[in-house]
């Protein structure tokens, strides 16, 4: 706190507010009889800049020229020092350093809409740190002038509140902005423009779309614009896309036909307007119109596959599977699939519409030649049917692909490789790689996956519906005309040791040997493809190492004989399972004593 200047005065020249880089004169003078007692020569006046001494003088006054002050405020304090006493504050001064306004740059004016008002913006340049008054002046024909002021440190926008009209669209107007503060002034370069230069139309409104005869090929976009609009640009895109299609149109009068829209697609449409071919600016984009185009009949054909299962001597089960058409092929909401089953020699046909599924199972006689046709239908029609002759896909042994392997390829991918069949490899028309989760019961409800591969390919990466720690039964089919050959393998994308061993459910004696039966490990505990089972046994109460028998894993197998047990000796038996990653923990332990006679 600096006391009011009772003992002396501080005067400042030229002002308390100065230009950056200029000099200020500070004079400190004592009032009469306010110096040290006895001798005025002993008056020592000291000038402080903040807390640092910058000058001193013996006598009644001190004069100091100060330069190099930074932007903002600097505090100076004048003090009196007498012998044998503390320094006494005389008076203080704050000097504020600012800058004169720079020339305002990039002055530009705009009138939003034909009924809007003229508003201008500019770049202020360097911050002056001072109250700066901006005056915007607009002069027009017939010596008309308008003026608007804003008194704000950060002023870079002013609205004249006047409306330019199109009566004389080529008349020139000139705008200029002047910035003034206590340290100086500066004016922008003048900006000259016409009505057409500065009127920015309002964005179009009331946008609608019409499809004549509910057809995507007869589509018209309608909108409303201000009266003087000459040009429009349209942009549109599918709602799920980031890229716009752009169209420029002249004298559209609020309508334009669009010819390249895709069926059954939600589009976003926006329109912008301009008054003149090369003058003025485009309006903002209109609000978006979102609309779905009508359906068209599906294109493309379904990818169909099938599976045959023997039921008895006279019947077989056929399971048909197909993949959904892509959105661009479906061209609408698929209402149903039409499946036609026909016996080729007798001509008897059966047609069924399937909704909500992409599979169909039926039972047919084992005799006769059967064919199926599957098509997809939306509200506008059906796709071309995919026709398949039902054959024994694995009948031709010479067409079976050779050396099939399945290897993990990163997360949730399996790379399947094979060699062409021995029979003339050029006869192969295509390969089909099929995979499904391995279920010990051979459950036909397990979803089937497949992909088609060109005849020159000898590998395929399967990734659809592949889960970690699940074993898949993979088949590679080579198809040639009405013949097929196949090979199969088990594979997984990721594996670890099974979480449990098989559960022994029975041990029976048969002619001096035993038959061990077990329950399969639950699928979720197998942790990949099982390679082997191990049966361990040792004499009860013995500390010796157990003996073991390793059995290659086969899906359907759940029993195995052992004939190396001694009669009338009690054994403890248990089982484990192995994947490529390691061995499971023990399953349950069972005791058994063979009753038969010793050899």
């Amino acid at each position: 706190k600096i006391d009011a200047c009772k003992r002396g005065d501080v005067t400042v020249k030229p002002s308390h507010v100065i230009l950056l880089g200029s000099t200020v004169n500070i004079t400190c003078s004592l009032k009469p009889r306010q110096g040290c007692f006895h001798y005025s020569r002993r008056n020592k006046l000291i000038l402080y800049k903040f807390d640092r001494r910058i000058n001193f003088h013996h006598g009644h006054s001190l004069n100091s020229q100060v330069t190099g002050l930074p932007l903002g405020t600097t505090l100076f304090v004048c003090k009196l020092a007498c012998i044998n006493s503390d320094e006494i504050q005389i008076c203080g001064a704050e000097i504020f350093v600012g800058v004169a306004p720079e020339q305002p740059q990039n002055l530009s004016c705009i009138q939003k809409g034909e009924q809007g008002t003229v508003a201008c913006t500019w770049e202020r340049g360097r911050d002056t740190h001072l109250y700066t008054e901006y005056t915007l002046q607009l002069s027009g024909p017939k010596n008309l002038t308008w003026q608007k002021q804003c008194k704000d440190i950060y002023c870079d926008y002013l609205d004249f509140g006047i409306n330019l009209t199109p009566e004389s669209p080529e008349s020139n107007f000139t705008a200029k902005v002047t910035a003034v503060n206590s340290l100086g002034s500066s004016s922008s370069l003048p900006s000259t423009f016409t009505f057409l230069d500065i009127v920015r139309p309002l964005p179009p409104w009331d946008i609608r779309i019409k499809f004549q005869k509910a057809s995507v090929s007869r589509c018209t976009l309608y909108w409303r614009d201000e009266g003087l609009v000459l040009l429009n640009r349209l942009r549109y895109r599918p709602s799920n896309s980031r890229l716009w299609n752009m169209v420029n149109v002249t004298k559209a009068k609020g309508r334009h036909d669009l010819l390249d829209l895709k069926p059954f697609t939600e589009y976003e449409f926006q329109i912008s307007s301009k008054l003149h071919l090369y003058k003025g600016s485009w309006s903002d984009w209109s609000e978006s119109l979102r609309a779905q185009t009508p359906e068209e009949e599906p294109t493309g054909m379904l990818d169909v596959w099938y599976m045959k299962r023997h039921i008895d001597y006279s019947r077989q089960q056929i399971s048909l599977f197909w993949k959904n058409l892509s959105v661009s092929e479906a061209r609408g909401k698929i209402l149903h699939y039409q499946v036609t089953l026909q016996e080729l020699t007798g001509g008897k046909a059966m047609t069924q519409n399937i909704t909500g599924h992409t599979s169909w199972t039926t039972v047919i006689p084992r005799t006769g030649n059967w064919a199926v046709a599957v098509s997809a239908a939306n509200s506008k029609g059906s796709s071309l049917p995919t026709r398949i002759n039902i054959m024994n896909l694995c009948e031709a042994g010479l067409l079976a692909p050779r050396q099939v392997s399945a290897n993990s390829e990163g997360m949730d991918n399996i790379l399947v490789t094979w060699q062409p069949p021995r029979k003339d490899p050029s006869a192969v028309q295509e390969y089909v790689v099929e995979w499904r989760e391995l279920h010990p019961g051979g459950d036909t409800q397990v979803p089937l996956n497949w992909l088609r591969s060109r005849p020159y390919n000898v590998s395929a990466l399967i990734s659809e519906n592949i889960k970690s720690y699940i074993c898949y039964e993979i088949r590679v089919y080579a198809l040639s005309g009405d013949q097929g050959g196949c090979s199969s393998i088990l594979g997984n994308s990721k594996h670890k040791a099974p979480l449990s061993g098989p559960h022994i459910n029975a041990i029976t004696e048969e002619k001096g040997s035993i038959l061990i039966s077990w329950n399969s490990i639950p699928v979720q505990e197998q942790m990949g493809c099982l390679l082997h089972y191990r049966i361990y046994w040792k004499e009860r109460d013995s500390n010796s190492q157990p003996q073991l028998c390793e059995i290659p894993y086969r899906v359907s197998q759940n029993s195995h004989p052992i004939n190396s047990l001694q009669p009338r000796v009690t054994y403890v038996l248990w089982m484990t399972a192995l994947t490529a990653a390691g061995e499971s923990s023990h399953g349950n332990e069972r005791e058994f004593c063979l009753q038969g006679k010793a050899n």
């Epitope: 600096i2 005065d9 505090l75 001064a93 002056t128 109250y131 440190i153």
Partner: nanobody, 119 residues
Framework: QVQLQESGGGLVQLGGSLTLSCAAS????????MSWYRQAPGKQRELVAE???????TYADSVEGRFTISRDNAKNIVDLQMNSLKPEDTAVYYC?????????????WGRGTQVTVSS
């Protein structure tokens, strides 16, 4: 922003005295500088005198020794004691207050009071 009200103007004889007063109201905190400016017909507005919140002063060369500026920080009042008035002192006198606004100064002006010196 601060509002400023000037008073004390009027007609005065050559060589006479007059005291102008300016009262600040509203958000009058942190007024850095209070000043008197004047504008004679057809001329630019010019600084007459200013006083900082610490009591330091500045005078235009043309009024030094004749005019005294003083300030009451508690009441936010600034007075301009004008002695030995001359015809060239005839002008509209404006009060101005500069306030801190962040790291900048924001100025407020009064509406002015007329001083006429007759010979």
């Amino acid at each position: 922003q601060v509002q400023l009200q000037e008073s004390g103007g009027g007609l005065v004889q050559l060589g006479g005295s007059l005291t102008l007063s300016c009262a600040a109201s509203g958000s009058a905190a942190l007024i850095f500088l209070m000043s008197w400016y004047r504008q004679a017909p057809g001329k630019q507005r010019e600084l007459v005198a200013e006083v900082s919140r610490y009591g330091s002063t500045t005078y235009a060369d043309s009024v030094e020794g004749r005019f005294t500026i003083s300030r009451d920080n508690a009441k936010n009042i600034v007075d301009l004691q004008m002695n030995s008035l001359k015809p060239e002192d005839t002008a509209v006198y404006y009060c101005k207050a500069d306030q801190y606004y962040g790291d900048s100064l924001r100025s407020s002006w009064g509406r002015g009071t007329q001083v006429t010196v007759s010979s």
